[in-house]
Interface confidence: low
């Protein structure tokens, strides 16, 4: 009977990439039939309750704050609802990852992030963000500043002792513009990330419009020069006439 309903949403009010000891606010969509909403973390296929709200659907969407983020609190989250005779409903899942140095130090080193062909591109072009590290990395994550959606995750490739992942953004749209960072993670805890790479700003410039502006400016300059030239000729011709007489 769960299939009769659309799946409720769950979202992180800020980025789902949280610094060590930071906090995040998680919002569960209010469900009309629910009288109790619980936030669950899924660890090793078992559910553990993180918090619960006795708010009802006609009140605001239930929110849960997770403070002092650490590796234990990182993972997959889901909202569980108590409803009428259907007993349970579940939201989609939300992945929360924590970024910071692992106690063992294996994630101490930041990866590097570069872009090909250029950090300034036009819409429709193909762009690749390359995340690299000289240290053992199982997966790389790419996050965009200010984005609430989950970061992109790619398995790393070993290239001559370098671990790397290529994130392809193609075709690029203006929505792709922004500041990116990448992170390393190990399969032992995929929700624990390294410190971020240096930020990389991707500028998506609409060259068609820019070129039209440039052409307009050039035309204006040429027109102005033409007017000035005509004016100069006219003035020069008048001076000659005066000299003849």
């Amino acid at each position: 009977q769960e299939g009769d309903f659309p799946m409720p949403f769950i979202s992180a009010k800020s980025s789902p990439v949280i610094p060590l000891d930071g906090s995040v606010k998680i919002q569960c969509q209010a469900i009309r039939e629910a009288y109790l909403t619980q936030l669950m973390i899924i660890k090793n296929s078992t559910y553990r309750e993180i918090g619960r709200r006795l708010k009802f659907w006609n009140e605001t969407d239930p929110e849960f704050v997770i403070d002092h983020m650490d590796a234990n609190k990182a993972g997959r989250y889901q909202c569980q609802y108590r409803i009428g005779h259907y007993r349970f409903r579940y939201s989609d899942t939300l992945e929360l990852v924590v970024t910071g140095e692992e106690p063992a130090g294996r994630l101490r080193d930041r990866p590097s992030l570069s872009v090909r062909p250029s950090p300034s591109v036009a819409p429709g072009e193909n762009v690749t963000l390359l995340c690299q590290s000289g240290n053992r990395t199982d997966t790389f994550l790419l996050s965009k500043e200010g984005a609430a959606h989950r970061p992109l995750r790619l398995r790393s490739q070993d290239q001559d002792g370098w671990y790397q992942a290529e994130f392809s953004l193609s075709p690029v749209t203006s929505a792709h513009g922004g500041t990116y960072r990448c992170y390393r993670s190990l399969s032992t805890n995929p929700y624990l990330l390294s410190q971020p790479s240096e930020p990389l700003a991707l500028l998506v410039a609409d060259y068609t419009m820019q070129n039209l502006i440039r052409m307009g400016l050039a035309a204006s300059v040429l027109l102005l020069l033409g007017i000035l030239l005509c004016q100069a000729r006219h003035d020069h011709g008048g001076a000659r006439e005066a000299a003849r007489s």
Epitope: Y35, L36, Q38, T46, Y47, E49, R52, R53, L54, K55, F56, E59, Q80, R82, I83, G84, H85, R87, F88, Y90
Partner: antibody, heavy 118, light 113 residues
């Protein structure tokens, strides 16, 4: 320690209404929903309904809709249940019970005995 | 509604004996996501309120003697008292909370010979 203190026994005439109370103490009252249960000789234990002590929203057993009305007063940490148009069938012991996170009743009130008799 | 059926309705045993009572539900009480059976056992001694013994079918409430054991999954559940004591004289109820329309079994009355 957690306690649910219910109001005393009631002897009432058929056709009238009665309101019984359940005061919670020893815990944060609004953190737990409150259930009401009827115990009669004929039907053993019957679930009446549940109320959110946080917002006052309710869910009733269809059988008790129109018969029972659950309310809550957060300021006094008290849950109430009013029973309307009483008949001899309503004579029973009524319990309030606090529900824990795992959907089981971990604390019960001592019960309120209702006798409906002319 | 989920119907809960308990058997036997009553039984009489001597102190020290082992006793088992059954509770069957008309549909499964196992939630596949949480891997929990939403079934609880309550003990009601004469003149007292019901008291929680077992929840999630097999988890003993703190303070409950370890002679009480809950078992079963899905639709068939059992409460076992390994060595009955005189103070165990009571009616035992099972209750499902899988469906919000909570329902109780009819109870099993335990008498001590």
């Amino acid at each position: 320690q957690v306690q649910l203190q219910q109001s005393g026994p009631e002897l009432v005439r058929p056709g009238v209404s009665v309101k019984i109370s359940c005061k919670g103490s020893g815990y944060t009252f609004t953190d737990y929903v409150m259930h009401w249960v009827k115990q009669s000789h004929a039907k053993s234990l019957e679930w009446i309904g549940v109320i959110s002590t946080y917002s006052g929203n309710t869910n009733y057993n269809q059988k008790f809709k129109g018969k029972a009305t659950m309310t809550v007063d957060k300021s006094s940490s008290t849950a109430y249940m009013e029973l309307a148009r009483l008949t001899s069938e309503d004579s029973a012991i009524y319990y309030c019970a606090r529900e824990s996170d795992g959907y089981y009743f971990d604390y019960w009130g001592q019960g309120t005995t209702l006798t409906v008799s002319s | 509604d989920i119907v809960m059926s308990q058997s036997p309705s009553s039984l009489a045993v001597s102190a020290g004996e082992k006793v088992t009572m059954s509770c069957k539900s008309s549909q499964s009480l196992l939630n596949s996501r949480t891997r929990k059976n939403y079934l609880a056992w309550y003990q009601q001694k004469p003149g007292q309120s019901p008291k929680l013994l077992i929840y999630w079918a097999s988890t003993r409430e703190s303070g409950v003697p370890d002679r009480f054991t809950g078992s079963g999954s899905g639709t068939d559940f059992t409460l076992t008292i390994s060595s009955v004591q005189a103070e165990d004289l009571a009616v035992y109820y099972c209750k499902q909370s899988y469906n919000l329309m909570y329902t109780f079994g009819g109870g099993t009355k335990l008498e001590i010979k």
